[in-house]
């Protein structure tokens, strides 16, 4: 996929809502300047293109949403990548000013001569993009046109602030709730001494700031912080790993707020360095329970404690996923390449049948085989519904006693689209009430994932814990399954009786040596000695003095 | 308004077969709706057989149906219909189709009157 | 596989009174939830979805709650015409389910 042909998915209807998905993966480092996309992707692409067309035919099929008033889509490829995304935008944008013009009757042909050809409708507002860098890109571009943007899973905390980011919204919470549970666990196990991995971008760069400040505030230190781009190239890997060798054995959990290609790349390294089980990584809803991340390399991910987002699994979506065919699913331009190279095989006679395959794909083949949904499913389908509940809340406003579009709602007004959609409040697909703050922001909820060897050769994501609303609750059983196992994150030990810390020059306040206080001095707190005053002594515990009783010596007593 | 009519319910011999009809007025089957066949014997409980998709043709049955029932659409003629092998007498019952709508999941908004099909020697 | 327990099979309520009807499903169903009303001889009509929503022209009286596994219905003001059967339904999901309906709820009215 070349930036020369852009593949668009469409479904017609009266309004057009854009969406931008990472279809294929970003390009890789040599393939930037053309701006050509990676592989296809299957839940963080394809599974989120299939909730955008069949959410909305749920919504179109609602006789109580948006009466008369039929949605439809343009859906875009991010390839998780801005300037990839912010080229897509352009075309939504572009399709709105051909619209508007053609409204005020500007549009003519070449020659001259006036068109008779209906443009495409205008975007009224954009689903995503995933990416909090990308995502950021976008709102730049669509805050200057009016058009709201409502995010699925760019949780950056930059994006809260509404003087820059005015037509932004989210169906997820800020990273600033994440860093902090990431930072309660850390204390709950009292690893006072760890090091610290971002990916490069929006997303790593805020989240580990936060991360940071919350450490330096409840007394624990990074040995180090590293950063390193997700799609940065084995070299760079194995040298962000042999630093944290460097830091070995002190510093061996790695709290990582990352992109689950960041995690990936980090695990590789360590299968091609030798480093299994060396480090316990902490990582951030990037990594959440994603097989993708881990899929050859669970040796190396044993143990790892990440964040997840707190969203079931949406049954309904699965019912109609599962079903999904090549020959029958035509108006998902990628699906064909997508089934490919699910099932490495050609789809003989098909259009996009690709030749690089040998094997020829037989008709047994489903969906169901190995199927994990997008574990943030329930978000994305969220954040669709909130467009629709925005847009029906807008229309019962403009239209009263008027089922469908009026003239009061054409063309359709982004501030007060944007006005209605800060005021939405609905059932999500959880179950939950969905609704938007000050800043266009979703509460959060996180489950507390643990990556496991549950029989041989056998790995998974287990449940060990939540963090609500500030409350961390863990299953320290399942964790370690029993206290000795709890693995060791400090710097320094705590001193003995009688010592104190003494921090060198330029280290970390969690690293220190100890020494021993002279025979006359105390521990007067933990960097200090002082002496005793004169006809005092230290006490037995060395944690003051006390005086020394008075001998008074008589001629008969003997030698002392 | 929108409409769903059963027909095809009959007396039938066990081991017979039977096609049952739905058809539906008031709305389109290209549009996308989940339309669904209930049974209810006498005196019992509702249960549910089986669903199509009526944009794709995806069908979904319970899981007891063992392949004796078979759900199929027609967008052009608006129907759906259910077609029953190997009737035994617990097959009777009136059998009922309904339309699932929108956000709530499958919910069952609209309903036939019902056909009763009696399985009996 | 989705299990759809209905308590009590049958209760016997006061004209005026208020009845209350429980609903358990076998796993979370994320208040995808529906309860229908039926008369004898009549089909099912739908009376509350997504678990607390009213369907159009139903009455405030009736009212749905619940979350994860556990849902109610509760009747209000029992008036003789709420004399029916009342069944709760899941809408989750159609995949590997046996029945996606509760067994049933008989409500008299004194």
């Known amino acids: 996929q070349s930036s020369e042909r852009r593949v668009v998915a469409h479904m017609p209807g009266d309004i057009i809502i854009g969406a931008l998905f990472s279809v294929h993966h970003q390009p890789t480092v040599d393939k930037v300047h053309e701006r050509k996309c990676g592989a296809v992707r299957e839940q963080y692409g394809i599974q989120r293109v299939e909730a955008m067309l069949h959410t909305l035919e749920r919504i179109n099929s609602d006789p109580t949403l948006l009466p008369n008033i039929t949605l439809g889509c343009e859906i875009r490829d991010s390839c998780w990548h801005s300037a990839v995304a912010l080229e897509q935008s352009i075309e939504f944008i572009r399709d709105s000013l051909i619209s508007s013009e053609e409204e005020e009757g500007l549009v003519r042909c070449v020659d001259g001569s006036s068109s008779s050809f209906r443009s495409k409708k205008p975007i009224v507002g954009v689903i995503g993009p995933g990416s909090s860098s990308v995502a950021i890109q976008v709102q730049n571009l669509l805050q200057l046109f009016n058009i709201p943007q409502i995010a699925y899973s760019a949780t950056s905390m930059d994006l809260s602030d509404k003087t820059l980011f005015k037509y932004f919204m989210r169906v997820v919470p800020s990273d600033a709730q994440q860093a902090r549970a990431m930072v309660d666990i850390v204390k709950r196990y009292n690893w006072t001494y760890v090091s610290a991995v971002h990916t490069e971008g929006n997303y790593g760069e805020s989240g580990m700031e936060a991360f940071k400040d919350m450490s330096a505030k409840e007394g624990i230190c990074i040995a180090h912080s590293y950063k390193i781009y997700s799609n940065a190239g084995e070299q760079s890997f194995d040298k962000l790993l042999k630093k944290l060798t460097s830091h070995l054995p002190k510093a061996r959990v790695v709290a990582c707020f990352c992109e689950g290609m960041t995690v990936r790349g980090l695990l590789m390294a360590m299968r091609r360095l030798g480093l299994a089980g060396e480090f316990l990584l902490l990582g951030s809803d990037g990594w959440a329970d994603r097989y993708d991340v881990t899929d050859g390399y669970q040796r190396e991910a044993v143990g790892g404690i990440t964040i997840k987002l707190q969203s079931p699994d949406v049954k309904w979506f699965d019912d109609y996923y599962l079903k999904l065919r090549p020959e029958t699913n035509h108006r998902n331009p990628w699906f064909q390449e997508f089934w490919q190279h699910r099932f490495q095989c050609r789809l003989e006679g098909f259009p996009q049948e690709n030749s690089k395959y040998n094997k020829t794909c037989n008709s047994s083949l489903t969906l169901k085989t190995h199927h994990v949904q997008d574990s943030k499913m329930g978000f994305v389908i969220n954040a669709i519904y909130s467009m629709a509940y925005g847009l029906h809340n807008m229309q019962m406003s403009l239209c009263p006693g008027y089922a469908g579009l009026c003239d009061a709602m054409k063309p359709i007004d982004g501030r007060k689209l944007l006005e209605s959609l800060m005021k939405t409040n609905f059932t999500g697909v959880s179950g939950d009430t969905i609704l938007f703050d000050e800043n266009g922001d979703s509460p959060g909820r996180y489950e507390i994932m643990n990556f496991k060897e549950m029989g041989k050769d056998y790995f998974d994501y287990i449940n060990v814990g939540s963090w609500d609303n500030g409350e961390l609750k863990m299953d320290d059983d399942e964790v370690w399954s029993k206290k000795s196992n709890i693995i060791r994150s400090v710097c320094s030990e705590p001193c003995e009786k009688g010592q104190i810390k003494v921090i060198r020059k330029g280290e970390v306040s969690c690293c220190w040596t100890c020494t021993p206080c002279k025979e006359n001095e105390y521990v007067f707190d933990e960097y200090t000695c002082k002496a005793c005053q004169l006809g005092s002594w230290p006490t037995d515990d060395l944690t003051g003095c006390d005086l020394i009783p008075v001998q008074y010596l008589r001629w008969g007593d003997p030698e002392p | 308004q929108e409409q769903l009519e059963e027909s095809g319910g009959d007396l039938v011999k066990p081991e017979g077969s039977l096609t049952l009809t739905c058809t539906a007025s008031?709305?389109?089957?290209?549009?996308?709706?989940?339309m669904c066949w209930v049974r209810q014997a006498p005196g019992k409980g509702l249960e549910w057989i089986a669903c199509i998709y009526t944009s794709s043709g995806s069908t979904y049955y319970a899981n007891w149906v063992n392949g004796r029932f078979t759900i199929s659409r027609s967008t052009s003629l608006n129907t759906v219909t259910l077609q029953v092998t190997s009737l035994t007498a617990a097959d009777t019952a009136t059998y009922f189709c309904?339309?699932?709508f929108g956000v709530g999941g499958y919910s069952f908004n609209l309903w036939g009157q019902g056909t009763l099909v009696t399985v009996s020697s | 596989a989705y299990d759809m327990t209905q308590t009590p099979a049958s209760v016997e309520v006061a004209v005026g009174g208020t009845v209350t009807i429980k609903c358990q499903a076998s796993q979370s169903i994320s208040s995808y939830l529906s309860w229908y009303q039926q008369k004898p001889g009549q089909r099912p009509k739908l009376l509350i979805y997504r678990a607390s929503t009213l369907a159009s022209g139903v009455s405030s009286r009736f009212k749905g709650s619940g979350s994860g596994t556990e849902y109610s219905l509760s009747i209000s003001g029992m008036e003789c015409d709420d004399a029916a059967t009342y069944y709760c339904q899941q809408g989750t999901t159609i995949s590997d389910v046996d029945n996606v309906f509760g067994g049933g709820t008989e409500v008299v009215v004194k």
């Open positions: 008031g709305f389109s089957f290209s549009n996308y709706y989940y």
């Open positions: 309904a339309k699932s």
